[in-house]
Interface confidence: medium
């Protein structure tokens, strides 16, 4: 396994400005073993294993605002622990191709 | 190292029932994988019989299910095969093996003759 | 269940010849594929799981590749040892099922 925290770049949006700001944050990256089995075993139902947060925080940024909208405050999550395990499907995007964290609807970023 | 080793009898009479043993050394069949039992039929022909896992489940080819019983004995390392109401169709090689991402070990193989 | 077919039963070859084999499945089995060496005794060797990943001890003349439901075994660099009988195995649906074994003979 080759599970670990990284340093990642997040996109935050300020929708009624029509732009993003980055943000630099902590989150889980890397491999997790798996076994591809050719005799699947009833009683153990298949779990794909993936490299997720085992602990995290969540810290709070101010968001500047624009013309008519007053600045904001955005809270996200900072992964504190890795591990490999189920994908929480109630707090995390466990879809194959998901946009990712960097991404940003509209064409302006913000520092 | 892992060794598979088949045992039973190698000649059974029509509609009498087959009894194989398979002992494993080496690893212990309830820690992990499936513990397999294929055959081969005279023209080559390779077939998955059945499997029992280290949980104790058990999966059957539906093809025998209503003639085939899998078993094991944890406290010898054995698991068995039982095939009732053989046929001289069921002549052939019979292999146990054990199962995880590919079928990674390999009896020597016992050979079934059925004949009266 | 998945049928395995291995069209071409029989296939010779020389000493330091790469060849090829394969195998199709009756429907997709998304790599799900295992290939075996059965020796003439009737040992019997898994060589690669998941199409293409090496089983531990084994020559990395040997290479597996294939999607869908087509997949392919490849040896290089023939050696003595390598003329046996070959079998593909789908681990996708159960029942596993193997297709019929090609035999790589010695020209």
């Known amino acids: 396994n080759s599970c670990e925290l990284t340093n990642i770049t997040i996109a935050i949006e300020k929708e009624e400005c029509r732009f993003c700001i980055s943000i630099n944050t902590t989150w889980c990256a890397g491999y997790c073993y798996t076994r591809d089995l050719v005799y699947k075993d009833p009683a153990r139902p298949k779990i794909q294993k993936t490299c997720t947060f085992k602990e995290l925080v969540y810290e709070t940024v101010r968001v500047p605002g624009c013309a008519h909208h007053a600045d904001s405050l955005y809270t996200y999550p900072v992964a504190t622990q890795c591990h490999c395990g189920k994908c929480d499907s109630d707090s995390t995007d466990c879809t194959v191709r998901g946009l990712g964290p960097s991404y940003c609807s509209f064409g302006e970023m913000k520092e | 190292d892992v060794h598979l080793q088949e045992s039973g009898p190698g000649l059974v009479k029509p509609s009498q029932s087959l009894s194989l043993t398979c002992t494993v050394t080496g690893f212990s069949i309830t820690s992990d994988y499936a513990w397999n039992w294929i055959r081969q039929f005279p023209g080559n022909k390779l077939e998955w019989m059945g499997s029992i896992f280290s949980s104790g489940s058990i999966n059957y080819n539906p093809s025998l299910k209503s003639r085939i019983s899998i078993t094991r004995d944890t406290s010898r390392n054995q698991f068995f095969l039982q095939l009732n109401s053989v046929t001289t169709a069921d002549a052939g090689t019979y292999y146990c093996?054990?199962?995880?991402?590919?079928?990674?070990?390999w009896g020597q193989g016992t050979t079934l003759t059925v004949s009266s | 269940d998945i049928q395995m077919t291995q069209t071409t039963s029989s296939l010779s070859a020389s000493l330091g010849d790469r060849v090829t084999i394969s195998c199709r499945a009756s429907q997709d089995i998304s790599n799900y594929l295992s290939w075996y060496q059965q020796k003439p005794d009737g040992t019997i060797k898994l060589l690669i799981y998941y199409t293409s990943r090496l089983h531990s001890g084994v020559s990395s003349r040997f290479s597996g590749s294939g999607s869908g439901t087509d997949y392919s075994l490849t040896i290089s660099n023939l050696e003595q040892e390598d003329f046996a009988t070959y079998f593909c195995?789908?681990?996708?649906?159960?029942?596993?099922?193997f297709g019929g074994g090609t035999k790589l003979e010695i020209k």
């Open positions: 093996a054990r199962g995880g991402t590919g079928t990674d070990y």
């Open positions: 195995q789908q681990g996708h649906t159960l029942p596993p099922t």
